[in-house]
C-alpha cells in the first residue's frame, strides 16, 4: 500500500509510523491525514514547513524523535493542529518562531526536552493553548513570564519533576492580571524549599498538586504557610508511594491550611500517626470533598457531624478500629483497602447515596438495613472483598439501591429468607465467590428491575439449577460460571425474555440441551466453555434462539464417536456461531484425542448383524 | 528466546524473557534479591514506554511446577492522583524509578515458578510490555 511501512489505523485520517527508522517526514501519507504518529524515529532536525504536506493535521506525535533543532515555521502549515507532542526530544535549538502558525493548538507536550526556562520558550502567541506540559525538565525558576497573560485559555500547567526550589511573589504576578480561575497547576516532584508568604495571595486555581516536594517537615510547614490567601478548588498534598522523603510528621505541619480557601482536599502517603487532629479537621470542616490516601491515622472520631463534607475518601489507611462516622451532609463515602478495624460498626450518614466499603476485610454482624448506614437515600453499595457478612435483614429502608456488590465476601444466611425482597429498584447485583449455597428458590425474589446478576463461584443444592429467576424479567446479563452445576431445570430461564448474555462456563455439564434456551428471544452470547460436554442429552437438538450470535463450547470433552454423529453434525451446523472453534477438540476416543471437532469427517455405517 | 538474568538470592534465582513481539528494552534491578522465604528491598526500573503509562495494570499468570494458577489482575495506576509517580509517565518519557517492596514469605515447595507479567495501559487499553519471569526455587533453603 502507498502508506507502508506505516500502519493505516483509520483510512485517510490516522496513520501510525512509530519506530520505523525514518530520518525524514514520510511523503507517502495522504494529505487528508488528521492524526500522525511519527514517534521513535530519528528525525533529529525539523526545518521550516516540515509538515506542509499535511494541512489537515490535528494530532502530531513526535515523541523520542531525537529532535535537537526546530527551525522557524517548522509547523507553519498546521493551522488545525490541536495537539503537538514532543516528549523525550533533546532539544538544543528552538527558534523564536518554532511554533508559529499553530493557530488552533490546545495541547503542547514538551516533557523531557531539556527545557531550562519558561522565559525563553516561544509560545506567547499560542492564545488557544489549554494544556501545557513541561514536566521532567530543567526549569529552576517558577516565574511565569509576561506572555502568560496572552494564554487566557490555559487550564493545565504541569511543571512537575523540574528543579524549582523557590517561589517568590513576583513569580505569579502575571496571574493577577488574568482571570484564570480554571487553572490546574502541578508542582509535584520539585525540590521546593521556600514559598514566599503572599506569593499565592488572592490567586484562584482549580487544582494545585504538591506531592513529594519537601524533604523536611519544617520546610513543608513553612511552604504551606506560604500558600496563605490561595483560593483553590482542589488541593492535593503529600507524597508518592515511590518518592518518599518525609519522616513521621505531626499535625502542625499542616496548620497553614487554615489560611487557604479549599473546596476539595486530598492528602496522600504521609507516615503521620495522626491522633488528635481535630484542629486540622476543623480547618477543613467546610470543604466539600475530603480524602486521605495511605495515611496512618489512629482514629477519626474527631470528624464532626456538622462538617460540610459531601465526599469522604479513606483509602489504604490504618485504623485502630472501624471509625465512628456520623456526618450530616455526606453523600459519598469511599472507605477501601484500609487496615485495622476488622468489624463494621454502624454509621450515621443521613444524606448518603454512594457507599464503597470494599477490600477492608470487614465482618458485618448484620446486613443490611437503613440503620446500619443511617440513610434511606443509598443508591450504590459495594461490600466486596470483605470477611463474613451475615444477612439478617432484607434491606429495609434501603429500597433506593441500584447497585449492590458483595463479590469475594463470605455471605451467611443467604438461603434463610428472601434477602433482596425490598430491592425493586436494583439494577446490578454481584454475589460472585461469596460461598453462597443456593438452597432456597426465593433467593432472588423482589428483584424486578435487575439487569445484571453475577453469581459465579457459588454452589447449588444437589448441583441443580432450579427456577430461581422468576422475578428477574428485566435481566440482560447472567453469570453462572464456576458453580459446580451438573443439571438445570428445563424452565430455569423461562421468564428471562430480555437476557442477552449467559455464562455457564466452568461447570460440570456432561451434555448440552437447547431446550432451556427456547424462551430467550434476546440471547446473544452463550458460554458453555470449560465444562465436560460429550454429547447432547436428547436426540432432537432444537435450534438456539435466532438472536444468538456467539456460542462458546471450547475446552469440553467431546466424544468423537459414531454414536454421537448427529450431535457432532449439529455442532458443525452451528459453525457461524462458534467462538474459537479451533479450540473445540475431541477428548475421546484416544486415537482422535486433541483433534479439532470441526475438521472431523465421521462417516459411520450401521453394522448389520 | 534470550534470558535476561536479574539476580540470585539464598533461595531463588530470577531471570526473564520477553513474551511480546516488541521486546522494547527494560532494565530491572532488585536489591537485595528477593528471597521467597520473605524479604524487603528495592526494585529499580529503567524503561522508555511506547505508550502513556496512565491506567496501568498487570495481568499476572503464575505457573507453579507446571500448574497454572488463575489469572490475577493488579491495578497500579487508576488515572488521576495516583500512588506512583511513574503513573504520569508519557510515551517516550524516561521512567527511572525505584519502588520499595516487602512481603512475608510463605512456604514454597521447591521447583520452577513462572510468572508472566502482561502490562496493559492507556485508553484504549493496549499492551505496554510483557515479561515472563522464571524463578527457580533452590531446594536447599526450603
Amino acid at each position: 500500500e502507498s502508506w507502508e511501512p506505516c500502519v493505516e489505523v483509520v483510512p485517510n485520517i490516522t496513520y501510525q509510523c512509530m519506530e520505523l527508522k525514518f530520518y525524514k517526514i514520510p511523503d507517502n501519507i495522504p494529505f487528508s491525514t488528521k492524526n500522525l504518529d511519527l514517534s521513535f524515529n530519528p528525525l533529529r532536525h525539523l526545518g521550516s514547513y516540515s509538515f506542509l504536506r499535511f494541512p489537515e493535521l490535528q494530532v502530531l506525535d513526535l515523541s523520542r524523535c531525537e529532535i535537537q533543532t526546530i527551525e522557524d515555521g517548522a509547523y507553519q502549515s498546521l493551522s488545525h493542529l490541536s495537539t503537538l507532542i514532543l516528549t523525550g526530544n533533546p532539544i538544543q535549538s528552538l527558534a523564536l518562531g518554532a511554533f508559529s502558525g499553530l493557530s488552533s493548538l490546545q495541547k503542547l507536550v514538551a516533557v523531557e526536552t531539556n527545557l531550562a526556562s519558561l522565559e525563553n520558550f516561544p509560545i506567547g502567541h499560542l492564545k488557544t493553548l489549554k494544556e501545557l506540559n513541561v514536566a521532567h525538565n530543567l526549569i529552576q525558576s517558577f516565574k511565569l513570564p509576561e506572555y502568560f497573560s496572552n494564554l487566557t485559555n490555559l487550564e493545565h500547567l504541569d511543571l512537575s519533576s523540574n528543579k524549582i526550589q523557590n517561589i517568590y511573589c513576583k513569580d505569579l504576578q502575571v496571574l493577577h492580571q488574568m482571570p484564570l480561575s480554571n487553572l490546574s497547576l502541578d508542582l509535584s516532584l520539585n525540590p521546593i524549599n521556600f514559598i514566599q508568604p503572599g506569593a499565592f495571595k488572592e490567586i484562584r486555581l482549580h487544582k494545585l498538586t504538591l506531592r513529594s516536594n519537601f524533604d523536611d517537615l519544617n520546610v513543608m510547614k513553612t511552604c504551606i504557610q506560604g500558600l496563605a490567601g490561595l483560593e483553590v478548588h482542589r488541593l492535593v498534598l503529600g507524597e508518592f508511594r515511590n518518592e518518599r522523603n518525609l519522616e513521621e510528621f505531626d499535625k502542625s505541619s499542616l496548620e497553614g491550611l487554615c489560611n487557604l480557601t479549599i473546596e476539595e482536599f486530598r492528602l496522600t502517603y504521609l507516615d503521620c500517626y495522626l491522633d488528635n487532629i481535630i484542629d486540622l479537621f476543623n480547618c477543613l470542616a467546610n470543604v466539600s470533598s475530603f480524602s486521605l490516601v495511605s495515611v496512618n491515622i489512629k482514629r477519626v472520631e474527631d470528624f464532626s457531624y456538622n462538617f460540610r463534607w459531601q465526599h469522604l475518601e479513606l483509602v489504604n489507611c490504618k485504623f485502630e478500629q472501624f471509625p465512628t462516622l456520623e456526618l450530616k451532609s455526606l453523600k459519598r463515602l469511599t472507605f477501601t483497602a484500609n487496615k485495622g478495624g476488622n468489624a463494621f460498626s454502624e454509621v450515621d450518614l443521613p444524606s448518603l447515596e454512594f457507599l464503597d466499603l470494599s477490600r477492608n476485610g470487614l465482618s458485618f454482624k448484620g446486613c443490611c438495613s437503613q440503620s446500619d448506614f443511617g440513610t434511606t437515600s443509598l443508591k450504590y453499595l459495594d461490600l466486596s472483598f470483605n470477611d463474613v457478612i451475615t444477612m439478617s435483614s432484607n434491606f429495609l429502608g434501603l429500597e433506593q439501591l441500584e447497585h449492590l456488590d458483595f463479590q469475594h465476601s463470605n455471605l451467611k444466611q443467604m438461603s434463610q429468607f428472601s434477602v433482596f425482597l425490598s430491592l425493586r429498584n436494583l439494577i446490578y447485583l454481584d454475589i460472585s465467590h461469596t460461598h453462597t449455597r443456593v438452597a432456597f428458590n426465593g433467593i432472588f425474589d423482589g428483584l424486578l428491575s435487575l439487569k445484571v446478576l453475577k453469581m459465579a463461584g457459588n454452589s447449588f443444592q444437589e448441583n441443580f439449577l432450579p427456577d430461581i429467576f422468576t422475578d428477574l424479567k428485566n435481566l440482560t446479563f447472567l453469570d453462572l460460571s464456576q458453580c459446580q452445576l451438573e443439571q438445570l431445570s428445563p424452565t430455569a430461564f423461562d421468564t428471562l425474555n430480555k437476557l442477552q448474555v449467559l455464562n455457564m462456563s466452568h461447570n460440570n455439564f456432561f451434555s448440552l440441551d437447547t431446550f432451556p434456551y427456547k424462551c430467550l428471544p434476546s440471547l446473544q452470547v452463550l458460554d458453555y466453555s470449560l465444562n465436560h460436554i460429550m454429547t447432547s442429552n436428547n436426540q432432537e437438538l432444537q435450534h438456539f434462539p435466532s438472536s444468538l450470535a456467539f456460542l462458546n463450547l471450547t475446552q469440553n470433552d467431546f466424544a468423537c464417536t459414531c454414536e454421537h454423529q448427529s450431535f457432532l453434525q449439529w455442532i458443525k451446523d452451528q459453525r457461524q456461531l462458534l467462538v474459537e472453534a479451533e479450540r473445540m477438540e475431541c477428548a475421546t476416543p484416544s486415537d482422535k484425542q486433541g483433534m479439532p471437532v470441526l475438521s472431523l469427517n465421521i462417516t459411520c455405517q450401521m453394522n448389520k448383524t | 528466546q534470550k534470558h535476561y538474568w536479574v539476580c540470585n538470592s539464598s533461595d531463588a534465582s530470577i531471570s526473564y524473557t520477553y513474551c511480546d513481539k516488541m521486546q522494547y528494552p527494560i532494565s530491572i534491578n532488585v536489591n537485595p534479591c528477593i528471597k521467597l522465604k520473605g524479604s524487603r528491598g528495592l526494585l529499580h526500573i529503567f524503561y522508555i514506554p511506547r505508550r502513556d503509562v496512565k491506567q496501568l495494570y498487570f495481568n499476572l499468570y503464575i505457573t507453579v511446577n507446571s500448574m497454572t494458577l488463575p489469572k490475577r489482575k493488579e491495578v497500579i495506576c487508576r488515572g488521576s492522583d495516583d500512588d506512583y509517580s511513574f503513573c504520569r509517565a508519557l510515551k517516550g518519557e524516561t521512567v527511572n524509578t525505584t519502588v520499595s517492596f516487602s512481603f512475608k514469605g510463605i512456604k514454597f515447595s521447591k521447583g520452577k515458578y513462572k510468572c508472566v507479567v502482561e502490562a496493559i495501559s492507556g485508553s484504549p487499553e493496549e499492551m505496554l510490555f510483557c515479561l515472563e519471569f522464571d524463578i527457580i526455587h533452590q531446594p536447599n533453603s526450603n
Epitope: Y305, T324, S392 | -
Partner: antibody, heavy 118, light 107 residues
C-alpha cells in the same frame, strides 16, 4: 410509629434473676437497629445496660457483663433482659429503647419499676 | 469509660428566664453528645442530637452547643412545662454513658 412496652414482675428477691420483656410494635426487631435496656435507680441517673442488634448480636456494659443476658423472640417481636444474682442496688426503673444509627435513643418504653427485696 | 459531669445538679428558675446547663466529658468526644428531657414518672425524651441538632417537634427555645469536651444546653425563655430533669449522653464510644442530670424547677 414505633412503640415499646416493658413487662415483668415488679418484685424480685435478692440473689434471684430479674426477667423483663419488651414488646415492640410498629417495627420488626429483625428489620434493623439495635434494641437496648437502660435503667434508672430511684432519684438517680440513667445507666446503659446493653443491647441486642437486629442480627442477634449482643453487647453489654462491662460493669454488668457477668450477670446480664439479652435475648429475643422474633415470632413475638420482643426482646428480653435477664439479670442474675440481683441485690438491692439493682432496684430501678428499667427502660427498653431503640437506638438510632447515631448513638442516641429517640424511642423509649414507658419503664417498669423493679424492686429487689425479700 | 467516658465520664460526663453535669452542672448544676439543681436549678430553680423563674418563667421567661434563660437556663444554661453544662456537660463536661472526661475526654474529647467531638460533637457526639445528645440531650434528653425527663419529666416525673415519664421516660426520657430526646431533645438535641450531636450537640446542636434539635429533634423535630422540639420547641425552638431549646438549643445546644459545644464540641470536644464542653457542651451546653440552653433553654432561651423557660416555660412552666419545661420543669424536668435534663441528661446529657455521649455517643462517642461504648459503653454509652449519661451525665448525672440537672433538675430544673420553676420558682
Amino acid at each position: 410509629q414505633v412503640q415499646l412496652q416493658e413487662s415483668g414482675p415488679g418484685l424480685v428477691k435478692p440473689s434471684d434473676t430479674l426477667s423483663l420483656t419488651c414488646a415492640v410494635s410498629g417495627y420488626s426487631i429483625t428489620g434493623g437497629y439495635s434494641w437496648h435496656w437502660i435503667r434508672q435507680p430511684p432519684g438517680k441517673g440513667l445507666e446503659w445496660m446493653g443491647y441486642i442488634h437486629y442480627s442477634g448480636y449482643t453487647d453489654f456494659n462491662p460493669s454488668l457483663k457477668t450477670r446480664i443476658t439479652i435475648s429475643r423472640d422474633t415470632s413475638k417481636n420482643q426482646f428480653s433482659l435477664k439479670l442474675s444474682s440481683v441485690t438491692a442496688v439493682d432496684t430501678a426503673v428499667y427502660y427498653c429503647a431503640r437506638k438510632d444509627s447515631g448513638k442516641n435513643f429517640p424511642y423509649w418504653g414507658q419503664g417498669t419499676l423493679v424492686t429487689v427485696s425479700s | 469509660e467516658i465520664v460526663l459531669t453535669q452542672s448544676p445538679d439543681f436549678q430553680s428558675v423563674t418563667p421567661k428566664e434563660k437556663v444554661t446547663i453544662t456537660c463536661r466529658a472526661s475526654q474529647s468526644i467531638s460533637d457526639h453528645l445528645h440531650w434528653y428531657q425527663q419529666k416525673p414518672d415519664q421516660s426520657p425524651k430526646l431533645l438535641i442530637k450531636y450537640a446542636s441538632h434539635a429533634i423535630s417537634g422540639v420547641p425552638s427555645r431549646f438549643s445546644g452547643s459545644g464540641s470536644g469536651t464542653d457542651f451546653t444546653l440552653t433553654i432561651n425563655s423557660l416555660e412552666a412545662e419545661d420543669a424536668a430533669t435534663y441528661y446529657c449522653q455521649q455517643g462517642h464510644s461504648f459503653p454509652l454513658t449519661f451525665g448525672g442530670g440537672t433538675k430544673v424547677e420553676i420558682k
